[in-house]
C-alpha cells in the first residue's frame, strides 16, 4: 500500500483581521493509526495550534468530523484572526504509540493577515512659525498588514513632494507602522490652510484614510502697524490712531507710550477678521496738546502672541497748537476700536 501523504493544497491563504481562516489538510491513507496536530512555524519554536487527541483550543474548530474513524479530512478553522496569527501552518500526522511520534508533515500553508492601518495622526511643530519659514509635520499610522502601503501629503489639495517616509520594522513582522515627515513652507495666507496625510492600503478598498492638521495651529502672522494723526476733534485735542493689521493668532497687547512713558495698555478684544483668517484691530489715543510744552513722541507698541514687541512712532508737533494756560497734565481717553472716530 502506498505510504500516507499529508496534503495541504493551499500554499497560502489571506484573511482579513477579525475573520476566520480555514486551513485545509487531508491525508491519503488511514494507516498508520494516530492523531493529527497542527503547528505554526517549524523547528523547536513551533507553536501547537491544535491537537486532535487532547487539549483545549477555543479558537480552533475542525471542518469535518475528525473523530470519525474513516475520516481523512483534518482541515481546521481558526476564528477571530489577528495579525499575530500570521505564519506558516503545518498539518502533521503522528503515529500512535507511547508517546505518539511524528510521522509526516504537510508542506505548510502560509497565512497572511490583512489588517487595516489606524487613522493617520498628523502633528505639527511644538512652536508657531512665521511666513517664509519651513516647518515639519509628521504623520503616523500603525497596525497594518501586509507591509505595502502608500502615503501622500497635500496642502490645500496640492500634493507635496518634500517628505520622507519609513515603514517599520524593515524585516518580517505581524504588523507594520508608517512614519512620514513633510516639510511645508508657510505663507501669510495659510491661516485657513490644511495639511493632509493620506494613507492607501489594500485593506481600504480604494478609500484612503486621512489625517489633517490645521496650519492655524502652526502659523503666526506678525502684525503691520500704522500710526496716524486724525483731524482735531476739539480745540487742544488730537486723536492718534494705531492700526494693527493682518495678524494671527488674536492674542495681542497694545501699549501707548508718550515720550517713552507708558500711557495706556489694552488687549485686543473686538477684532475684525479678514478673508484670509488674519485679524485687524485699531486703538486710538486722545492727546491734550495743551498739557505739553514740547513736541510729543507717541509710540504704539504691540506685543503679539508672546513675541518681542514691535512699535511704530508718531511725532506730534505741539507748536502747531495753541496752549491752554494753567494746564500741565495730558487728559487721555481710553480709546479702542469700540469707540473709534469713524
Amino acid at each position: 500500500e502506498e505510504e500516507l501523504q499529508v496534503i495541504q493544497p493551499d500554499k497560502s491563504v489571506s484573511v482579513a483581521a477579525g475573520e476566520s481562516a480555514i486551513l485545509l489538510c487531508t491525508v491519503t491513507s488511514l494507516i498508520p493509526v494516530g492523531p493529527i496536530q497542527w503547528f505554526r512555524g517549524a523547528g523547536p519554536a513551533r507553536e501547537l495550534i491544535y491537537n486532535q487527541k487532547e487539549g483545549h483550543f477555543p479558537r480552533v474548530t475542525t471542518v469535518s468530523e475528525s473523530t470519525k474513524r474513516e475520516n481523512m479530512d483534518f482541515s481546521i478553522s481558526i476564528s477571530n484572526i489577528t495579525p499575530a496569527d500570521a505564519g506558516t501552518y503545518y498539518c502533521v500526522k503522528f503515529r500512535k504509540g507511547s508517546p505518539d511520534t511524528e510521522f509526516k508533515s504537510g508542506a505548510g500553508t502560509e497565512l497572511s493577515v490583512r489588517a487595516k492601518p489606524s487613522a493617520p495622526v498628523v502633528s505639527g511643530p511644538a512652536a508657531r512659525a512665521t511666513p517664509q519659514h519651513t516647518v515639519s509635520f509628521t504623520c503616523e499610522s500603525h497596525g497594518f498588514s501586509p507591509r505595502d502601503i502608500t502615503l501622500k501629503w497635500f496642502k490645500n489639495g496640492n500634493e507635496l513632494s518634500d517628505f520622507q517616509t519609513n515603514v517599520d520594522p524593515v524585516g518580517e513582522s505581524v504588523s507594520y507602522s508608517i512614519h512620514s515627515t513633510a516639510k511645508v513652507v508657510l505663507t501669510r495666507e495659510d491661516v485657513h490652510s490644511q495639511v493632509i496625510c493620506e494613507v492607501a492600503h489594500v485593506t481600504l478598498q480604494g478609500d484612503p484614510l486621512r489625517g489633517t492638521a490645521n496650519l492655524s495651529e502652526t502659523i503666526r502672522v506678525p502684525p503691520t502697524l500704522e500710526v496716524t494723526q486724525q483731524p482735531v476733534r476739539a480745540e487742544n485735542q488730537v486723536n492718534v490712531t494705531c492700526q494693527v493689521r493682518k495678524f494671527y493668532p488674536q492674542r495681542l497687547q497694545l501699549t501707548w507710550l508718550e515720550n517713552g512713558n507708558v500711557s495706556r495698555t489694552e488687549t485686543a478684544s473686538t477684532v475684525t477678521e479678514n478673508k484670509d483668517g488674519t485679524y485687524n484691530w485699531m486703538s486710538w489715543l486722545l492727546v491734550n496738546v495743551s498739557a505739553h510744552r514740547d513736541d510729543v513722541k507717541l509710540t504704539c507698541q504691540v506685543e503679539h502672541d508672546g513675541q518681542p514687541a514691535v512699535s511704530k512712532s508718531h511725532d506730534l508737533k505741539v507748536s502747531a497748537h495753541p496752549k491752554e494756560q494753567g494746564s500741565n497734565t495730558a487728559a487721555e481717553n481710553t480709546g479702542s476700536n469700540e469707540r473709534n472716530i469713524y
Epitope: 517549524a42 523547528g43 523547536p44 519554536a45 513551533r46 507553536e47 501547537l48 511520534t101 511524528e102 520594522p169
Partner: antibody, heavy 122, light 107 residues
Framework: EVQFQQSGTVLARPGTSVKMSCKAS????????MHWVKQGPGQGLQWIGA????????TYNQKFKGKAELTVVTSTSTAYMEVSSLTNEDSAVYYC???????????????WGQGTLVTVSA | DIQMTQSPSSLSASLGERVSLTCRAS??????LNWLQQEPDGTIKRLIY???SLDSGVPKRFSGSRSGSDYSLTISGLESEDFVDYYC?????????FGGGTKLEIN
Amino acid sequence: EVQFQQSGTVLARPGTSVKMSCKASGSTFTSYWMHWVKQGPGQGLQWIGAIYPVNNDTTYNQKFKGKAELTVVTSTSTAYMEVSSLTNEDSAVYYCTRSFYYSLDAAWFVYWGQGTLVTVSA
Amino acid sequence: DIQMTQSPSSLSASLGERVSLTCRASQDIGSRLNWLQQEPDGTIKRLIYATSSLDSGVPKRFSGSRSGSDYSLTISGLESEDFVDYYCLQYASSPFTFGGGTKLEIN
C-alpha cells in the same frame, strides 16, 4: 529523573575534528529537540543548533553552519555533535540541553548536561 | 537575530540585599524568556521560565517580571550561594539567544 551525560574532555590539534556525545535518560528521547550550546573561556553562552530525533530535522545558528554537525542515534538515546576544522576559537565548553517537540514554555532548557571541554592546541 | 542586552555585566552586593538584573530584547519575544544560573563549576540550572514562572525547587526569593521589552530577575534577600553567574535566554525565535551574563559578587 532526566539526565544528560556528556563525553569527557578533549584535547585536539588545529585543523582536526572532534565528536562529542550527550546520552539522555529518564524520558522519551524522541519527544524532544536536542540543543547544543557553546561557552568560550570567560565568555557567555551561544546557541549552536538543535536536532529532532524523530526525523533528524536540524536547525542551526548561521554562525555555526559548516562548523558543527548534529546527529542522533535514537536506539541509544544519544545526540552527537561534530566540530570540524578546529581553531583556537573552538576551545570552549559545549553543553547539551533540550526542548519539547513544540514550543512548550515549561520544557525549554530545563535539563543540561555537565558540559564537554574542548581544548584546541598545537 | 534577536539581541538580548543584559545589565549589569557584574554586580557587587551584600548578603540579605535585594538586587535586580535586566535583559532588554531587541524585538518582541512575548513572555518567552528564561533565567539561568551557572555555578563556578559550569553547572547550569534554570530558575525562571516564561518570564515569571518559578521552576520547582527554586527558592521563592527569586522572581521574574517584565515591563515592555525589559525583563528582570529579582533576588530579594541574597544568600551566599546566589553569588554566581546569571543569563537570560529568549526562545521566541531561532537562533535562540542569550544575554551577555551578569556576575554577582559578594561585597
